[in-house]
């Protein structure tokens, strides 16, 4: 008799795919255009990269430290109307994308959380999101929350009000803290909350470093979901040297919980890396007449146009890994394992019950390197097979589908491989 | 049960004032969030503003911002709807609604569960 299959575990949308942050309408939509009529003809866009759920914003009216002039119900003017948000819902929802609004207070100003007045701030959170999950949102962001005064007894009050509306809506808490401690004591009183922080930003980016991290983090929070960025709000490429970008997102897709990335990661937007570029929130790439004022500023191969059309970019890429990510039972809610691998590599399993299997093999190091996975640490339910297809590489030059042989296994420089294999009885 | 009587309506010159008055009585008031609502001859019922159970957040619609304020007085029980620069097309049956499972109300009327009769304005030109 065939054995019996393992029961499903409860999924959430938000645990079947990534989100997207859009934390400047104006800068994902280009110089100066940008609002929520606009962002609504970009939703192809979004649902292209397979993106579960769209956080935006903040949007609301908020005048620079000014209590008084800021409205959490009110949505800021430039950014468009309500009726404008209510109908962006609506094509969001037909695409099936989330929208999580960031009602973050003090957007504008210096402390994100008026530090004098919290109390009466902290109201008006409360209020806002009773207001706007009658608008149809599906969750919220709050962000710095390491700044707010007896944040986790806030943070419990709101997530009551997002499940209390409905066990489908999420909140999202933003820190820029790194500090493992600080995190779990945010995360033990809010029991479904996802947290961002800049945990994997304060990394030596070497494969035993990284390791450390991840498995320090997942034991710290138990069978907890988790997310996974390397900040609360900012780019990938703030964080990260160049060469690790395509090692990271494929690391950050294949992770036990749900990745966040912002606008622009899945094309490699780098702050500031443009005369005249804000730093905070760079122009997101369209083509290359995105940068209009300074002709041959912007490449192709920059640029969601040029990458689109380029199977090896990081974009392509971005878009594989999202598939894989929101349709592979191991990577959606598999069990997670790592084992012992060459120095400088990181490598891991997911599998769940009798589906397909996947390795992940990530080299961080400079240098080529021989795999040397030892499946010995693993165990029984996830040995190694001797062979696995390779559903994707980082680097250009392998041929998709080859069966490779796991004890001669080589790879590249900051070369991360993926790798698929069956379940055997 | 929530019961709501409105008060305040009547008569005036368009550019000029009115203050509606909606008494509850019933159900913890404090912990309701309240909005009023209005009904022209022909049409149907729309929002005019809410107001949260603390009362420090208010919410109004495009056609009535910056000339209505909406305020609530829980020691009293009751939310008070001022209309300044009142216009020929405010002229409609004002009615004052209670959100039991909100702090906060919405601007569609499915989420009050408790209505007043109403109480009729008429601006004339």
């Known amino acids: 008799r065939a054995p019996r299959c393992r029961e499903l575990p409860a999924q959430k949308w938000w645990h079947t795919g990534a989100l997207y942050r859009i934390g400047d309408l104006q800068a994902f939509q280009g110089h100066g255009s940008g609002n929520l009529a606009g962002l609504k003809g970009r939703l192809d866009y979004l649902s292209s990269l397979k993106v579960k759920g769209l956080v935006l914003g903040p949007l609301h009216k908020n005048q620079k430290d000014d209590v008084a002039q800021t409205d959490l119900l009110q949505i800021d003017p430039n950014f468009g109307s309500k009726e404008d948000f209510d109908n962006l819902l609506q094509s969001a929802k037909k695409k099936s994308i989330r929208v999580i609004l960031d009602l973050t207070p003090n957007y504008r100003g210096e402390n994100l959380w008026f530090s004098t007045q919290v109390d009466s701030v902290a109201t008006k959170v409360k209020d806002a999101l009773e207001f706007w999950l009658q608008a149809g949102v599906d969750g919220f962001q709050v962000r710095d929350i390491e700044n707010l005064k007896d944040a986790s007894s806030f943070l419990a009050e709101w997530e009551n009000i997002t499940k209390g509306f409905s066990e489908d809506r999420l909140l999202i808490a933003g820190t820029n803290s790194s500090d493992l401690q600080q995190i779990v004591s945010l995360l033990e009183s809010n029991k479904d909350l996802l947290l961002t922080s800049s945990y994997l930003s304060d990394s030596s980016f070497t494969g035993e470093h990284t390791k450390s991290l991840v498995t320090q983090y997942l034991n710290a929070t138990g069978n907890r979901w988790c997310s996974w960025s390397l900040s609360q709000a900012g780019l990938l490429t703030s964080f990260l040297p160049a060469q690790l970008l395509r090692l990271y997102q494929l690391m950050l897709f294949t992770l036990p919980g749900t990745p966040v990335f912002s606008y622009g990661d899945e094309i490699g937007l780098k702050a500031a890396a443009l005369p005249g570029q804000p730093v905070e929130a760079p122009v997101m790439l369209w083509d290359e007449s995105s940068f209009p004022d300074i002709p041959g500023a912007v490449s192709a191969n920059m640029t969601v146009k040029g990458q689109s059309e380029d199977p090896g970019s990081l974009l392509s890429l971005f878009r594989q890994l999202s598939d894989q990510r929101s349709k592979e039972r191991s990577l959606l809610h598999g069990d997670f394992h790592t084992f012992s691998s060459g120095p400088g590599l990181f490598s891991y399993i997911r599998h769940w019950d009798q589906n397909e299997r996947f390795l992940v093999v990530l080299n961080f190091g400079d240098v080529g390197l021989s795999a040397g996975l030892q499946a010995s640490d693993l165990p029984a339910s996830a040995s190694l097979p001797t062979k696995a297809d390779l559903v994707l590489s980082t680097q250009p030059g392998r041929e998709e589908g080859s069966p490779l042989e796991l004890e001669r296994l080589k790879l590249e420089p900051h070369e991360g491989l993926l790798l698929r294999f069956p379940y055997v009885a | 049960q929530v019961q709501l009587v409105e008060s305040g309506g009547g008569l005036v010159q368009a550019g000029g004032s009115l203050r509606l008055s909606c008494a509850a009585s019933?159900?913890?008031?404090?912990?309701?969030?309240m909005g009023w609502f209005r009904q022209a001859p022909g049409k149907e019922r729309e929002f005019v503003a809410t107001i949260s159970c603390s009362g420090t957040s208010t919410y109004y619609a495009d056609s009535v911002k910056g000339r209505f304020t909406i305020s609530r007085d829980n020691a009293k029980n009751t939310v008070y709807l001022q209309m300044n620069s009142l216009k020929p097309e405010d002229t409609a049956v004002y009615f004052c609604a209670a959100d039991t499972r909100h702090c906060m109300g919405y601007t569609k009327d499915e989420g009050y569960a408790y209505w007043g009769q109403g109480t009729q304005v008429t601006v004339s030109s």
């Open positions: 019933g159900r913890a008031f404090s912990s309701n969030g």
